[in-house]
């Protein structure tokens, strides 16, 4: 009786179970009662990453430098090329098809996590006792100056954007 279902890594065609082509190979011809499935390796610029019956391999992704992309990992016959972004840029999506500059954290905000090729800068508001007076993609919130340790007193309170201003203590006569 002709099969109605096939084993793993097989496919049903012409009432027959044929072997799928292994990753890195494409289908040339289906199996017969006399021959196995005929498969051919993908060319250097192509890949197939699953057991398949594809008659064409997929083209490796192109990391376009005009879009700020560069190769993170070269593709093989079984894997696609992985792109990442050049220094100072990060991917706009998970598939990393284009890049945008890392955002800077505005005054009052510090860098919680520095950007990578695939993720943007993560900023956090400076909590009480900390400040940031610059727009930066690298700087964290800095602690207010401790006037006491310098034998000085606070003359002007700090904010999330400004440091405290220290001054000499008033002399008691």
């Amino acid at each position: 009786e002709p099969p109605t279902a096939c084993r793993e890594k097989q496919y049903l065609i012409n009432s027959q179970c044929c072997s799928l082509c292994q990753p890195g190979q494409k289908l040339v011809s289906d199996c017969t009662e006399f021959t196995e499935t005929e498969c051919l390796p993908c060319s250097e610029s192509e890949f197939l990453d699953t057991w398949n019956r594809e008659t064409r391999c997929h083209q490796h992704k192109y990391c376009d430098p005009n879009l700020g992309l560069q190769v993170q990992q070269k593709g093989t016959s079984e894997t696609d090329t992985i792109c990442t972004c050049e220094e100072g840029l990060h991917c706009t999506s998970e598939s990393c098809e284009s890049c945008v500059p890392h955002r800077s954290c505005l005054p009052g905000f510090g860098v919680k996590q520095i950007a990578t090729g695939v993720s943007d800068t993560i900023c956090e508001p400076c909590p009480v006792g900390f400040f940031s007076n610059v727009s930066s993609a690298f700087e964290k919130c800095r602690p207010w100056t401790s006037c006491e340790t310098k034998d000085l007193v606070v003359q002007q309170a700090g904010t999330n954007k400004t440091d405290v201003v220290c001054g000499p203590q008033d002399r008691q006569r």
Epitope: V28, S29, C31, T32, E33, F34, T35, E36, E38
Partner: antibody
């Protein structure tokens, strides 16, 4: 018991024709593809033709394509090989063989075809 | 066309000895290779399928190995009835092709 019995061989002149038969028994003939394989005297094995279980697909090497025709009659459990425009190099023992899991798992005893003037 | 080259053409051995027969394919055929034995005046008989799978009724002294382009048929200890001609056959693509054969003869 699986059995394949070839017949129809004999002496034929170059350019002549011959029809070989293969009678099958001991298995469900219509479930199996069958091939013809030949062996010239003192030589190795050479594949000649194959036909699918349903008879809808036939296969030939280039050196016999257009001259030989394989066919089958599942109702009669029989396989045939019509050979036309025979040449001296077609002289050989012709075997029919059953295709089981893509292997020639059972063979007939062969029939001798001699092409000579 | 895939060409199968068998070596040696002749192997002269004594009963009880180990026989190692080689079959090389002109291009990769995965494990799509069978082995057959043929004795004088007889039809070939299937010995090993898919390069290494045993066949019911075939003695365990016959074994096959290999994948890709290089294949081996091993007879662990030759019996008198094993002296015959051995053929490999590929079924990776059309046309089906056989090797030229290796004759195992008594030394």
């Amino acid at each position: 018991e699986v059995q394949l019995v070839e017949s129809g061989g004999g002496l034929v002149k170059p350019g002549g024709s011959l029809r070989l038969s293969c009678a099958a028994s001991g298995f469900t003939f219509s479930n199996y593809g069958i091939s013809w394989v030949r062996q010239a005297p003192g030589k190795g094995l050479e594949w000649v033709s194959s036909i699918s279980s349903g008879g809808d697909n036939t296969y030939y090497p280039d050196n016999v394509k257009g001259r030989f025709t394989i066919s089958r009659d599942n109702a009669k459990n029989s396989l045939y090989l019509q050979m036309n425009s025979l040449r001296a190099e077609d002289t050989a023992v012709y075997y029919c063989a059953r295709a089981g899991e893509k292997a020639m798992d059972y063979w007939g005893q062969g029939t001798l075809v001699t092409v000579s003037s | 066309e895939i060409v199968l080259t068998q070596s040696p053409a002749t192997l002269s051995l004594s009963p009880g000895e180990r026989a190692t027969l080689s079959c090389r394919a002109s291009q990769t055929i995965n494990n799509n290779l069978h082995w057959y034995q043929q004795k004088p005046g007889q039809a070939p008989r299937l010995l090993i399928k898919y390069a290494s799978q045993s066949i019911s009724g075939i003695p365990a002294r016959f074994s096959g190995s290999g994948s890709g382009t290089d294949f081996t048929l091993t007879i662990s200890s030759l019996e008198p009835e094993d002296f015959a001609v051995y053929f490999c056959q590929q079924f990776s693509s059309w046309p089906l092709t056989f090797g030229g054969g290796t004759k195992v003869e008594i030394k």
